[in-house]
Structures are given as structure tokens and as C-alpha cells.
């Protein structure tokens, strides 16, 4: 969490941003809040990006003002216009690109003063893994697949019964480049698994960590997966 204050002495307002990550090809949110003003016409929101000449986005007098918007963001940005009045200056970024990564500044002007805060935005690819029993294999084998990751992640297997065990010798992981030549499909196979045990396939890069669990018993198979972004720090 980054909290910024205005630089004009007593005429300052608090602006808060949260570092976040964008998933390439999907829509992302750059989070920013501020002390709300009472009337929409007095609120100006400017989003800027380090190293970019034009504005990322500008909202003033109750509507978008995009005449100074940089070409790389044309048609891809929007604020939540209905939420500006209660202090939400967050920016929606459509079709996130690798090149969108960087330092952004959320700059706010209201009748109470000015304020700004920076936000670190990482971009990459991350997806939920799915773990299945591989019935085609000669021995009891689990197969963990996740369709889109970038940068290349690490994959680690764990088991509830054999806690702390190193499965690197009995697993094999491959990374297959997807058609857009950036993201990769992750496939990891774990051999010699035993029933009545829960196995976890953990995929992690510097942006996200995802886990796929599978519990195999004589009578049923239970699956669960979750994904966590690693860098949600507020400013």
C-alpha cells in the first residue's frame, strides 16, 4: 500500500494506491483511492506512467478527457465514472500487454487540494492449475497442467503424507510455448503416487503463486485449486 500526500502544504489530500499485477491479454485494474470531494466537477484524475510522454488517462469535469492520451493506451483505459464521487480513481486497463509493466502515478486534484501516489504494476501470465490422474501411464501418475504462465515459473510437488519430501526425482516438468510466442503451457507429471494421500502441484513466478490439490482415495478423487498474486503492496 502506498499512501501519498499532496505537496502543497496544508492544501493536500491523501491518495492511496496498491501495487498489482496484470495478466497478459486480459483486463487489469490499477487501484487508486482518494479523499472524496462533494461535487464531481471539482475532481481531476490523471494517470501517468514513467517513461511515457502522454497521459495514460485523464478524467475531469465529470468525464474522460483523452486529448493528451499516449498512443499506447488509446482505447484501452477507463475509470469507474460512477465511483469517482466516493473517492475511487482506479483505472481499468484493457488487454494488458507485457509493455504495460512499470511505475504509474495516480495524481488527484479536488477542491481540497492535490495529492499523488505511485504504483508498481507488473505484467505476466498466470493461470489455475488442474491436477488429474493420468490413467494412460503404466504406474499411478498425476498430471498437473496450467495453460498460461510468464515468466517461466518453478513447479514443486508436495504431499500431505510425506511432508518435506523432495519429489524432483520422481517428477518431470515441461514448458510449451503458446501460439502468441510469449506465454507457456506448464505440464508437470508426478510418478509413483500412492492412494489415500493429498498431492499439491505448486506453480510460482515473481508475479503469482498457484496451487492445484488432488486427493485420491479408493472411492473418489477430490480437486481444489487457488491462485494468489504475490505483490499486492499498498502505497
Amino acid at each position: 500500500l502506498i499512501i501519498g500526500f499532496g505537496i502543497s502544504g496544508r492544501h493536500s489530500i491523501t491518495v492511496t494506491t496498491v501495487a498489482s499485477a496484470g495478466n497478459i491479454g486480459e483486463d487489469g485494474i490499477l487501484s487508486c483511492t482518494f479523499e472524496p470531494d462533494i461535487k464531481l466537477s471539482d475532481i481531476v484524475i490523471q494517470w501517468l506512467k514513467e517513461g511515457v510522454l502522454g497521459l495514460v488517462h485523464e478524467f475531469k469535469e465529470g468525464k474522460d478527457e483523452l486529448s493528451e492520451q499516449d498512443e499506447m493506451f488509446r482505447g484501452r483505459t477507463a475509470v469507474f465514472a460512477d465511483q469517482v464521487i466516493v473517492g475511487n480513481a482506479s483505472l481499468r486497463l484493457k488487454n494488458v500487454q507485457l509493455t504495460d509493466a512499470g511505475t504509474y502515478k495516480c495524481y488527484i486534484i479536488t477542491s481540497k487540494g492535490k495529492g499523488n501516489a505511485n504504483l508498481e504494476y507488473k505484467t505476466g501470465a498466470f493461470s489455475m492449475p488442474e491436477v488429474n490422474v493420468d490413467y494412460n501411464a503404466s504406474s499411478e501418475t498425476l498430471r498437473c497442467e496450467a495453460p498460461r504462465w510468464f515468466p517461466q515459473p518453478t513447479v514443486v510437488w508436495a504431499s500431505q503424507v510425506d511432508q518435506g519430501a523432495n519429489f524432483s526425482e520422481v517428477s518431470n516438468t515441461s514448458f510449451e510455448l503458446n501460439s502468441e510466442n510469449v506465454t507457456m503451457k506448464v505440464v508437470s507429471v508426478l510418478y509413483n503416487v500412492t492412494i489415500n494421500n493429498t498431492y499439491s502441484c505448486m506453480i510460482e513466478n515473481d508475479i503469482a503463486k498457484a496451487t492445484g490439490d488432488i486427493k485420491v482415495t479408493e472411492s473418489e478423487i477430490k480437486r481444489r485449486s487457488h491462485l494468489q498474486l504475490l505483490n499486492s503492496k499498498a502505497s
Epitope: 472524496p36 468525464k63 464521487i85
Partner: antibody
Framework: EVQLQQSGTVLARPGASVKMSCKAS????????MHWIKQRPGQGLEWIGA????????KYNQKFKDKAKLTAVTSASTAYMELSSLTNEDSAVYYC??????????WGQGTSVTVSS | DIVMTQSHKFMSTSVGDRVSITCKAS??????VAWYQQKPGQSPKLLIY???YRYTGVPDRFTGSGSGTEFTFTISSVQAEDLAVYYC?????????FGAGTKLELK
Amino acid sequence: EVQLQQSGTVLARPGASVKMSCKASGYTFTSYWMHWIKQRPGQGLEWIGAIYPGNSDTKYNQKFKDKAKLTAVTSASTAYMELSSLTNEDSAVYYCTSTVRNVMDYWGQGTSVTVSS
Amino acid sequence: DIVMTQSHKFMSTSVGDRVSITCKASQDVRTAVAWYQQKPGQSPKLLIYSTSYRYTGVPDRFTGSGSGTEFTFTISSVQAEDLAVYYCQQYYVTPLTFGAGTKLELK
């Protein structure tokens, strides 16, 4: 659950002053504007002004600048409005209303003020 | 001050009817308009904000539209519980101002 609890009915003499309260619960009191609205019997709604409890910033409708004084005590999550030099024209129901999610989305039940000699 | 004019003080309707209430601003208020419902003896309730966004829990028979100076609030199929006074409000500039209200009553 967001709630705004207003003080009870007031009967006052012309020329007197009254102070009414609005106790907020269920949200961060210091982060949102608290507005005050006047409604005379059978009439429409008039915006008196608003206070931002986080820093006591106030905005007034010029019409009520000399009539109403808005204050807030953050430790008690309570906003106050004092009306001075009362006349019959001040007989009305006064609402406090906050902008927690959006424009005036939570309202108190109203405080009825009757000015009579 | 911006004047919000609701052209009808009263509107007669029947259950199941579609009804539209108009509100005209004396100057451009972009989309910073809200609509409230008030029943006798009750506090007003927010129905629509930012011209067309339905507030949480508001049935989808209530809609809003417009921008600039002309705004419309519509109930697609009036229910008995919708009989009330409806107010428009601008929050583009202070002082925040309301329309005089339109009372929806049964024919």
C-alpha cells in the same frame, strides 16, 4: 450494516437555537461526506451542506450559511447540525445522509423540528 | 445554482403501466444525476446514481437515462409499492440541488 441514527423531535421557540445529532455505525465515519437535507411539510428536498469528518472540511449552501453549523466528533462517529435564530420557516424534518457507496445512499430517519411560540 | 425541473408534479398511472418521469437541468451536469424515491413518513431512498446505475438491491424495472441537461427515470411495469414521490438530484456542482418531486398516484 450501515446505520444513521438521528436525535428525536425538537420543539423550540422562535429566536432559539437547536442542535441535532446523527450517529453513524457500520462504516468508516471519517472517510465519507455527511450531508444534511431539509424537508418542509409537503415540500421537496433542500441541501443544507455537508461535512467531511476526516478533516472537518465543510461545504454549505449559501442560503443556509448563517443558519446552520455543521460539526463532527470522530471519536463518537457522530455528526451534528446546529440551527440558530429559529423562525417558522425552519420548521421541517432534517435528514442526515452519507455517501458510503455513492450519492446519498444511506439516510437517517429524520429529526422533526417545530418552531412555535 | 443549478435548477432541476421536474415538469410533472403529479402523474397518474395503473399497476403494470410503463411510466417515465423527466428532469431538466438548467445547465450541463454531465451524468452526475441521481433519483430518489420517498414514501409518506419515510426517508428518501437512492434508486439510480450517475444517471443510469441502479443502486444495490433496486429492482431492474427502475432505469435511468440521459446526459447533459435532460434526464429520464422510467418504471417499466409499475407495482403498487412504487406509488411514491420521486426526486431527481444533481451533484455536479454545489449547492447540490433537487427537483421539486413527482408524485406517482393511481388513476
